[in-house]
């Protein structure tokens, strides 16, 4: 819901927007995603800090812990146990890396109103969870696992092996954490609780990454992390199955891999219990075009893991990596054996298929030039999902629901119509078998959360819709945007264009280019923002772009795996190709054009300053990639293959950017780094620096010391204050 | 406060029944491996028996197997012990202790006498 | 089954003496060993679990070690509520079985 234009009589109550307006995150929005406990309750947080327990049925909410209790020990966070019993109060937050935090634990009994007191947890804690029955604990302690039977019981060690940077169970190392699982925790709850799958990483033959914090004391600290680059030596990873009734009785179990896995150098991709015997596995072969789905069974007899061959399934790509930015996982039916899962089709679409027996006889669910994003909840007659199928714009996602009770199959768009203008971006969280789920939408307008009926799809109440964020925008004149495609040699370039309020097409305005584009990444969505660049085009009159080029996502694999091997080449070519159109359309000053990005962003943009094109003026590359040898091996693998000789060496070695350092002397370069950068290494920019120097070539440069890859905290306002002066001084503009 | 009060000993002769009870509060019964723990007079302590959380699994020692039978009601918060076949060297004071993990005993009742004499 | 074999089955000690106590098992148990005190018509009462952790309540003089086959049970310091028989116990197969005991006596 954007603030409708006004006449003119009121344009003059209306303001710019200000830098200051972004760096105090004047207008951020909120979203409600209900805390689910049950079919028909949820849990959350009110203003006040009190934890709520909302009955949808009843219509009727008590507080379960007061704020008092929260505030008692600083509590950041809580956790309800499933038996309703005990709440977990974690304080102490202590950020590690991307997922990963440490922090403090303290268990409040909720029938007595006290914090259980004997056999407390110990502090710091690196995760802990509920089982998803009763209130069973189980936590990762100093590398290693332990177990509770009850929170106020003494606990029971799992793993004894655990060493700092040597060997993780139950939470992953580095590289397990930011490029294939995605969270803080490698442990696995089986349904009732009566397992506990749990990974073991050992890091011992991985090269460590060093580099200095210099705090506050009169010598820095050294950070080493364990970290393989690409080719180096990669962790091993085993996977371990615990009874946690009885886990003293055979000990950890070990789940076997997959022979054709083992053969090689390998990953584990994710675990998905299916009941409390059977457990699903995916594995990926180190040259990530192969994975494979293994379902394993509980022996009784022996206490052992089966996994039978026949119920393997392979899942290969022949054109690019297996699966999107991760391999998918898979929903299970109720039969517990047979799943839904998204993977491409034979006309190279990610859709849904439903695998009873082998993957070659899946059933295709879903089909078109579209793709299905995320399955969110298989019931007994009902797969809710999201796609961008919607009007054909690749940038959107809808929730759609699809009978399986029935044949054939009907499909409805549960959120097509909802708010059409307002939301056109979806997720959605779904509570036990369905029976009502929240409906979060993220824009284009301003945000709203809505609770529907599982049955129905009725709206039963508005959650959250940024009332005050509507009021606060009602004065502010905020930027046009569109979003668009160019068609450009058999390729579809779509773009979001960021206009300033009062856009003229016969003006020439300065360009930015913002850039991402990773492989399986998307820019151009259709979600509410007001930020940088909003600040860019409403107060500066700057015109802003977005472009997702090839290599980018949910637009069929020719587009997503055109990269494949050569990362560094058609990224760029696209993002220039898309300057030239932009060039044509009459309003831009082709002498102010300029590109920036942040990350792979921050590769791509110097990638492209370094073209030799003569299209840009000047560009900022925060936090680069410069050559694909200092990245991460699981994340660079995936799309480059092995730095040998007799794989891919030689594209390794044409995509840097220190190759290109010669080009830069025509351009005006900010390069911008974190000292204390553990995902995209200092290492990075040093090298570009360097070769620049070597080069006498000028440059700008910032650092920001003892920062990580987010420049995070008062390093923010310092970045895009300094990002903001080089822009305007590049464009003419005043201060 | 974890309570475990035995019932049901006595005197038998050989060859007689006995069932012991072990009444169970302070904790959450439904959750956690019950188990029997016996000594005979000025000896030391032998285990006798353990059940599952939710009694389908039962252990017992060599020397009561096919005699006693470890049952329990959950909706009772009880553990029992039916003790068949009887003979002169299961006199023993009988423990009812929480077994957590299958592993320590971390909570005992006070006892039972059970003389088996004629 | 497992055998366990505590040694001395006796011991005479003062006040303030630091007293060992050792338990073998006839094969690796790991960490799973424990740790029992009873007194004279009393129940047995659980000191230490998972060979070196201390149970709640259990007074600091009281330690475990261990791993594998070879376990001791130290007190520090002995005071007089801590004669009392002392027995081991493994938990490792779901079979547990006893030391036969030590008795600490005062000297």
């Known amino acids: 819901l954007r603030p409708s234009r006004v006449h003119n009589s009121e344009e003059n109550t209306m303001r710019a927007l200000t830098l200051k307006d972004i760096l105090n995150g004047t207008f951020s929005y909120k979203t409600f995603f209900p805390n689910w406990i049950s079919g028909q309750e949820y849990l959350h947080q009110s203003a006040d800090n009190n934890i709520v327990l909302y009955n949808i049925e009843t219509g009727q909410s008590y507080t379960i812990l007061s704020n008092r209790t929260m505030k008692s020990v600083n509590a950041s966070n809580y956790g309800l146990s499933p038996d309703r019993q005990f709440v977990y109060l974690e304080s102490d937050y202590s950020k590690l890396w991307r997922y990963s935090y440490t922090a403090t634990y303290y268990i409040y009994d909720l029938s007595n109103g006290e914090f259980v007191r004997g056999n407390e947890l110990p502090r710091p804690i690196q995760y802990l969870c509920w089982s998803p029955v009763g209130s069973k604990l189980a936590y990762v302690y100093q590398n290693n696992i332990y177990l509770k039977q009850r929170p106020g019981d003494p606990p029971f060690q799992i793993t004894f092996n655990g060493r700092e940077n040597k060997i993780f169970n139950g939470i992953p190392d580095w590289v397990y954490e930011e490029e294939m699982l995605a969270t803080k925790y490698a442990l696995w709850w089986s349904p009732n609780g009566k397992f506990l799958a749990y990974a073991e990483f050992n890091d011992t033959d991985i090269p460590v990454i060093a580099y200095s914090y210099y705090g506050d004391e009169q010598y820095p600290r050294t950070i080493n992390i364990p970290y393989p680059k690409a080719g180096a030596k990669n962790p091993v990873v085993r996977i371990f199955i615990i009874d946690t009734t009885y886990p003293a009785y055979v000990g950890p179990q070990e789940v076997p891999v997959p022979a054709m896995i083992a053969s090689s150098d390998y990953y584990f991709s994710w675990l998905t219990w299916v009941t409390d015997e059977r457990v699903c596995l995916q594995w990926l072969k180190r040259v990530q075009n192969v994975s494979v789905l293994s379902i394993c069974d509980f022996r009784e007899d022996w206490q052992t893991w089966d996994c039978p061959k026949t119920q393997e399934h392979i899942e290969e790509s022949r054109t690019g990596w297996a699966g999107g930015f991760f391999v998918s996982t898979p929903v299970f039916s109720y039969d517990a054996i047979s799943y839904y899962k998204i993977f491409s089709d034979k006309d190279g679409y990610k859709h849904i298929h439903y695998i009873k027996d082998t993957v070659e006889n899946a059933i295709q669910i879903t089909s078109g030039k579209w793709e299905a994003i995320n399955i969110f909840r298989v019931t007994q007659d009902s797969l809710f999902y999201s796609s961008n199928e919607f009007e054909e714009y690749p940038g959107r996602r809808n929730i759609y629901r699809i009978s399986i009770g029935s044949y054939p199959p009907s499909k409805k768009c549960v959120t097509c119509h909802l708010r059409k203008e307002r939301c056109q971006y979806y997720t959605a969280s779904f509570s036990d078998y369905a029976k009502y789920y929240a409906l979060v939408c993220y824009g284009p307008g301003i945000p709203i959360s809505t609770l529907h009926d599982g049955r129905t799809d009725q709206e039963i109440k508005i959650l959250e819709e940024n009332k005050e964020l509507e009021n606060a925008l009602k004065n502010i004149q905020l930027p046009k945007e569109e979003i668009k495609k160019l068609e450009v040699d058999e390729i579809t370039l779509w773009y979001k264009m960021i206009l300033p309020p009062q856009f003229d097409r016969s003006k020439k305005y300065p360009l930015l280019i913002q850039v991402y584009g990773g492989p399986c990444s998307q820019s151009v969505r259709s979600v509410f923002a007001v930020n940088w660049i909003s600040y860019l085009a409403s107060k500066e009159g700057m015109v802003i772009a977005l472009v997702d080029g090839r290599g980018t996502a949910f637009q069929g694999d020719k587009l997503l795996y055109a990269v494949y091997r050569k990362l560094g080449v058609y990224e760029v070519e696209d993002q220039i190709t898309a300057v030239r159109k932009f060039i044509e359309m009459g309003f831009i000053d082709e002498k102010r054009i300029a590109i920036w990005g942040w990350s792979y962003g921050g590769y791509v943009s110097s990638l492209a300053l370094a073209s030799g094109t003569g299209l840009f003026k000047c560009g900022i590359a925060v936090a680069p990639v410069s050559s694909w040898e200092y990245y991460a091996s699981v994340y660079t693998e995936r799309f480059m293959g092995l730095p040998t000789k007799d794989d891919n060496l030689e594209h390794y070695k044409n995509s840097t950017v220190m190759a290109r350092a010669e080009y830069f002397r025509n351009v005006d370069y900010l390069l911008i780094h974190g000292t204390a950068d553990d995902n995209v290494h200092f290492q990075n920019s040093a090298q570009i620096a360097k070769a620049l120097v070597n080069a006498q070539v000028d440059f700008q440069a910032m650092w920001y010391s003892d920062q990580n890859h987010g420049l995070s905290g008062l390093s923010t306002n310092h970045l895009y204050t300094h990002m903001t002066h080089f822009l305007k001084q590049c464009f003419s503009l005043s201060d | 406060e974890v309570q475990l009060v035995e019932s049901g000993g006595g005197l038998v002769q050989p060859g007689g029944s006995l069932r012991l009870s072990c009444a169970a509060s302070g904790f959450t019964f439904r959750g956690y491996i019950m188990s029997w723990v016996r000594q005979a007079p000025g000896k030391g302590l032998e285990w006798v028996s353990w059940i599952s959380p939710e009694g389908s699994r039962t252990g017992y020692a060599d020397s009561v197997k096919g005699r006693f039978t470890i049952s329990r009601d959950n909706s009772k918060n009880t553990l029992y012990l039916q003790m068949n076949s009887l003979r002169a060297e299961d006199t023993a004071v009988y423990y009812c202790a929480r077994l957590l993990y299958g592993t320590w005993f971390d909570y005992w009742g006070q006892g039972t006498l059970v003389t088996v004499s004629s | 089954d497992i055998q366990m074999t505590q040694s001395p089955s006796s011991l005479s000690a003062s006040v303030g003496d630091r007293v060992t106590i050792t338990c073998r098992a006839s094969?690796?148990?790991?960490?799973?060993l424990n740790w029992y005190q009873q007194k004279p018509g009393k129940a047995p009462k659980l000191l230490i679990y998972a060979a070196s952790s201390l149970q709640s309540g259990v007074p600091s003089r009281f330690s475990g070690s261990g791993s594998g086959t070879d376990f001791t049970l130290t007190i520090s310091s002995l005071q007089p509520e801590d004669f009392a028989t002392y027995y081991c116990?493994?938990?490792?197969?779901?079979?547990?079985?006893f030391g036969q005991g030590t008795k600490v006596e005062i000297k």
């Open positions: 116990q493994q938990g490792r197969l779901l079979l547990p079985t």
């Open positions: 094969q690796s148990i790991s960490s799973y």
